[in-house]
């Protein structure tokens, strides 16, 4: 019996359906066809799951979280023996392994592993300012994203003609902060921040105003 | 106490129907395959049907297919065999047993009842 | 459907035996065999698993062997509490399939 070699790592959109991949070759009938399906998911690498099960002719339920979400691709007993998840979470994310015994025939590989990594696009980021707004003051622009796998890069611009930060402004893409220091009236203006990773964007807008200093009445 | 209770047996008439149930206690219920096995009197046991945790996956004997429904409440802690169209030879002692999956060997995985309730009984006379 | 006959249909002993019981299925079904304990009136009992394993609780006078086709459940000393009814159920196919069984009697 030899497990063919998977393509490594999948990754799929949160709530999309993913399919995993296993398929065998074996110089055996199908009559006693063993498979299990197990994720040693990324958040609890500790707690390996059973997923789905095949044994004697019978299918059988994995963890209750993948209940009514999880599949095999085909009818069985059958030498492809790849599963689909739907709806997939966060959660699910993990190194998945089929197990697959064909009695009589032993020996080869009978393990596949398949990484499966979901991906989350940035929720909408919050927006702040830290600092003071007075005219000649020092202020960072802050960005940041609750969700987002991979983790997001963050592009702030000014809603100018330009597009273009100050002068005086630097930028963490990856922290998601824009400083700019020696703010001047100039400075004001509504700023976006443009959260992104590989599978979409999400926006959010300031408005920066900066205070200048009121005249004195001299007495 | 992990407990299987079953209970709604008795006599009925040849194509009369019967539903049995099963109460679970003492363990998580939603997360065990189960099944039904029957033994007719002076016979031995004879598997009768499955059902996987989730109800996606159901399993029924010759014997029975077409006339006996396997079901489950998992809000309920409840498993049940509605049987319809009953036949002198469907008169047995009902069992409701937990399948448990055992692993054994390196990867291999075996099912077997490993909690059983006490069984009630079903005769079917006119 | 995998037939399975176990021998003797029967059997008569003392406490303190030590008593042997076959179970033969009709195609190799490796290991996947298991042995179940029945008393009247009362729950059934797993016994032992894939051939040879000792379920959780069950005392060590009880094992079980052999692969295949040919399995044997034993019970070193008989106690008076074994006099019961003992099955054999394959889980290598579907449908699940138990032999006809076998009741040890005292004599």
């Known amino acids: 019996l030899e497990v063919s070699e998977s393509p490594g790592s999948i990754q799929v959109a949160r709530g999309q359906p993913a399919v995993l991949p296993c398929t065998f070759t074996t110089s055996a009938a199908l009559i006693n066809l063993n498979v299990i399906w197990m994720v040693t998911p990324l958040s609890n690498a500790n707690q390996p799951e059973q997923v789905i099960l095949y044994q004697g002719g019978q299918m059988f339920d994995g963890a209750p979280r993948f209940h009514g979400r999880v599949g095999f691709t085909g009818t069985m007993p059958a030498t492809n023996v790849s599963i689909f998840i739907n709806n997939t979470q966060l959660s699910d994310t993990g190194t998945y392994q089929c197990l697959v015994n064909n009695l009589p025939d032993i020996g080869g590989r009978n393990i596949g592993v398949t990484g499966l990594t979901v991906l989350v696009p940035p929720s909408a980021p919050h927006c702040q300012i830290q600092g003071s707004q007075d005219i000649g003051s020092d202020v960072i622009l802050l960005c940041s994203s609750e969700e987002g796998i991979p983790r997001p890069t963050y592009l702030w611009e000014k809603l100018d003609n330009t597009l273009k930060l100050p002068p005086t402004a630097t930028q963490d893409q990856v922290q998601g902060t824009v400083t700019i220091r020696n703010i001047s009236a100039l400075s004001s203006g509504l700023y976006q921040c443009v959260a992104s990773n590989a599978i979409g964007t999400s926006t959010c807008l300031l408005d920066l105003q900066v205070i200048s200093p009121q005249p004195r009445n001299i007495g | 106490e992990v407990q299987l209770v079953e209970s709604g047996g008795g006599l009925v008439k040849p194509g009369g129907s019967l539903r049995l149930s099963c109460a679970a206690s003492?363990?998580?219920?939603?997360?065990?395959?189960m099944n039904w096995v029957r033994q007719a009197p002076g016979k031995g046991l004879e598997w009768v049907s499955s059902i996987s945790s989730s109800s996606s996956y159901i399993y029924y004997a010759d014997s029975v297919k077409g006339r006996f429904t396997i079901s489950r409440d998992n809000a309920k802690n409840s498993l049940y065999l509605q049987m319809n169209s009953l036949r002198a030879e469907d008169t047995a002692v009902y069992y409701c047993?937990?399948?448990?999956?055992?692993?054994?060997?390196?990867?291999?995985?075996?099912?077997?009842?490993?909690?059983w309730g006490q069984g009630t009984m079903v005769t079917v006379s006119s | 459907e995998i037939v399975l006959t176990q021998s003797p249909s029967s059997l008569s002993a003392s406490v303190g035996d030590r008593v042997t019981i076959t179970c033969r299925a009709s195609?190799?079904?490796?290991?996947?065999l298991n042995w179940y304990q029945l008393k009247p009136g009362k729950a059934p009992k797993l016994l032992i698993y894939a051939a040879s394993i000792l379920q959780s609780g069950v005392p060590s006078r009880f094992s079980g062997s052999g692969s295949g086709t040919d399995f044997t459940l034993t019970i070193s000393s008989l106690q008076p509490e074994d006099f019961a009814a003992y099955y054999c159920q394959q889980s290598y196919s579907t449908p699940r399939t138990f032999g006809q069984g076998t009741k040890l009697e005292i004599k």
């Open positions: 047993a937990r399948g448990q999956l055992l692993w054994f060997g390196e990867s291999a995985l075996i099912d077997a009842f490993d909690i």
């Open positions: 195609q190799s079904i490796s290991s996947y």
């Open positions: 003492g363990f998580t219920f939603s997360s065990y395959s």
